[in-house]
């Protein structure tokens, strides 16, 4: 069938202290998030079809002012990458919250069946779980 | 026919003082904006085909420096949502101009025929009407 | 054939002093960048198929803190436009790095065979060449 794999996820929770990963959830019962092709494995998104994908993300910090992001010596950073299989581990997209409270970006990237994408939020600030402020998605665009 | 509904709009004007909505316009005579499927109803974008859409927006403040956004005024916020029918009213995408003068983001979301999207700019500041600084678009990506 | 033209590029280098253009490169040997349809002409992206395209970009400044971007009187600005043929020259997308170190955006725009896209970075700050921080791409979405 035509590879129209697509997913849009909402934030479920952050990981324990030593785990920078964000944990995602999706499905109509949760609101406007969905998985049609890709799947979730312990809150991480796994690709099921080879191809070029548009990956997009927006993350908003929960309790945030421009001073809260600028005051921190180690800026809060969001990185989206392939975290498994280990042989394909790579950072795909990286942004820092300098004096802002939201990052948003998108990129085209080749992904393969079995690639698991991780979204790592480094720093001490917590992300908002509001579904219009923090979301993560992929869209298959061509083989 | 294959649902390739797509639109890219440019800012026409802001609403009167108590109306936070931005009013959009589109069409080849105006430049590089267009509507192919969706339609405008009093400056608001109405969807004519069910499906999952990629919604994207960029808004730049007209007179802005980092001092004006951080020092001078209460946070200006942009929210994209379904504003009618009332039964489907929801915020899809929300961003604040903390220390910046531009917000830009995108997301995948299911939309239905008849959904009207509103872009609400709260705060006192005026958005730029330059077509390369402020624009709003949707693209049907799958059923 | 179905017009699935698509490209994702990584930064090769900046231009000489009087040339604000960024010079791009792409291909599997370089990492996750690729050109499938569009082509590069001296580091600038040339379109080979008419249609509506989703254009996206992210640029991160190499040595950057919020003070380095806010200190400059003339803010660093990124503009994506058609630079040739001259008869079609236009700015498509423009963003300033006010108190931030990264800009990212996307838009839908009609492009024609032979259009060459330029990405002009004005100001004195240098862009990062990290492939997860700075990238530029286009995706054909419909005729």
């Amino acid at each position: 069938s035509l590879g129209w794999d697509i997913a849009e996820l909402q934030l479920n929770h952050t990981g324990p202290q030593q785990d920078p990963r964000l944990y995602w959830q999706g499905g109509p019962a949760l609101g406007r998030s969905f998985l049609r092709g890709p799947e979730l494995d312990k809150g991480q998104l796994r690709i099921r079809r080879d191809g070029i994908y548009m990956v997009h993300i927006q993350v908003t910090l929960a309790i945030c002012s421009s001073t809260s992001t600028s005051r921190h010596h180690h800026p809060t950073t969001l990185a989206v990458g392939i975290c498994s299989p280990a042989s394909r581990s790579i950072s795909l997209l990286r942004l820092s919250f300098h004096q802002g409270c939201t990052i948003a970006s998108q990129r085209l990237t080749p992904l393969a069946r079995g690639d698991t994408l991780c979204t790592n939020l480094t720093g001490t600030l917590l992300p908002s779980r509001n579904t219009d402020e923090t979301f993560f998605g992929v869209q298959w665009v061509r083989p | 026919s294959l649902g390739w509904d797509i639109a890219e709009l440019q800012l026409n004007h802001t609403g009167p003082q108590q109306d936070p909505r931005l009013y959009w316009q589109g069409g080849p005579a105006l430049g590089r904006s267009f509507l192919r499927g969706p339609e405008l109803d009093k400056g608001q974008l109405r969807i004519r085909r069910d499906g999952i859409y990629m919604v994207h927006i960029q808004v730049t403040l007209a007179i802005c420096s980092s001092t004006s956004t951080s020092r001078h005024h209460h946070p200006t916020t942009l929210a994209v949502g379904i504003c009618s029918p009332a039964s489907r009213s929801i915020s899809l995408l929300r961003l604040s101009f903390h220390q910046g003068c531009t917000i830009a983001s995108q997301r995948l979301t299911p939309l239905a025929r008849g959904d009207t999207l509103c872009t609400n700019l709260t705060g006192t500041l005026l958005p730029s009407r330059n077509t390369d600084e402020t624009f709003f678009g949707v693209q049907w990506v799958r059923p | 054939s179905l017009g699935w033209d698509i490209a994702e590029l990584q930064l090769n280098h900046t231009g000489p002093q009087q040339d604000p253009r960024l010079y791009w490169q792409g291909g599997p040997a370089l990492g996750r960048s690729f050109l499938r349809g569009p082509e590069l002409d001296k580091g600038q992206l040339r379109i080979r198929r008419d249609g509506i395209y989703m254009v996206h970009i992210q640029v991160t400044l190499a040595i950057c803190s919020s003070t380095s971007t806010s200190r400059h009187h003339h803010p660093t600005t990124l503009a994506v436009g058609i630079c040739s043929p001259a008869s079609r020259s236009i700015s498509l997308l423009r963003l300033s790095f006010h108190q931030g170190c990264t800009i990212a955006s996307q838009r839908l725009t009609p492009l024609a065979r032979g259009d060459t896209l330029c990405t002009n970075l004005t100001g004195t700050l240098l862009p990062s060449r990290n492939t997860d921080e700075t990238f530029f791409g286009v995706q054909w979405v419909r005729p």
């Epitope: 002012s65 001073t67 | 802001t14 003082q17 007209a62 007179i63 802005c64 420096s65 001092t67 004006s68 020092r71 001078h72 005024h73 209460h74 006192t124 500041l125 005026l126 730029s128 009407r129 330059n130 | -």
Partner: antibody
């Protein structure tokens, strides 16, 4: 340093026309907020009109709408106020006010130019 | 349309503190407008003093002494200009202005007299 200097005031008959000018210096004129504010003799300040960023927006007080036109010449860094169908109530000192990085404030003021409308 | 009301006059002694009020009509919330303050001395053009929205969102005009500060009183739907350590040169007319989306409106002004 933001500086603005008004000119063009004078004595006019009711129904007449007049064009005020405001020469600006010390800031990027085209991306700024420029306004006219007037003060009738012995009265308070009244906002008249504003023009924003590359002439993208123009706004007018109800009392002058359709009679006054605000405009700029970015090449000359000059703001104008074309006043038509003048009334005695328009008699005032007209101030030019500017803000280079925030539209909501009148940061820099000129000395004003006197407009008198009388028969 | 916003309407701003200021007391026409106020007098106080040198060294004292005064509070000038700028009340917005009930149809509009002070939180929806940017309130700024201007000083005008006899025979001179107005001078920008300050803008205030909150403690973290305010702006002092160039060369304006820190004796001048802003505040808001949400319950009274009013902007406030506070002047401490009043000095004879503070005698002037004080105007507030409210801004939203292109349009400005001024209050009627308060004439501040410094006694003695």
């Amino acid at each position: 340093q933001l500086q603005v200097v008004e000119s063009g005031g004078g004595l006019m008959q009711p129904g007449g026309s007049l064009r005020l000018s405001c020469a600006a210096s010390g800031f990027t004129f085209s991306g700024s907020a420029m306004s006219w504010v007037r003060q009738a003799p012995g009265k308070g300040l009244e906002w008249v009109s504003s023009i924003y960023s590359h002439s993208m927006y123009t706004y007018y007080a109800d009392s002058v709408k359709s009679r006054f036109t605000i405009s700029t010449d970015n090449a000359k860094n000059t703001l104008y106020l074309q006043m038509n169908s003048l009334k005695p109530d328009d008699t005032a000192v007209y101030y030019c006010a500017a803000s280079s990085d925030y539209e909501g404030l009148f940061v820099s003021w000129g000395q004003g130019t006197q407009v008198t409308v009388s028969s | 349309q916003a309407v701003l009301t200021q007391p026409p006059s106020l007098s106080a002694s040198p060294g004292s503190s005064v509070r000038l009020t700028c009340t917005l009509n009930s149809a509009n919330s002070v939180g929806s407008y940017d309130i700024s303050w201007y000083q005008q001395k006899a025979g001179s053009p107005p001078r920008y003093l300050l803008y205030y929205y909150s403690d973290s969102l305010s702006h002092q005009g160039s060369g304006v002494p820190s004796r001048f500060s802003g505040s808001t009183d949400a319950s009274a739907n009013a902007g406030l200009l506070l002047i401490s350590g009043l000095q004879p040169e503070d005698e002037a007319d004080y105007y507030c202005s409210a801004y939203n989306r292109g349009s400005h409106v001024f209050g009627g002004g308060t004439k501040l007299t410094v006694l003695g």
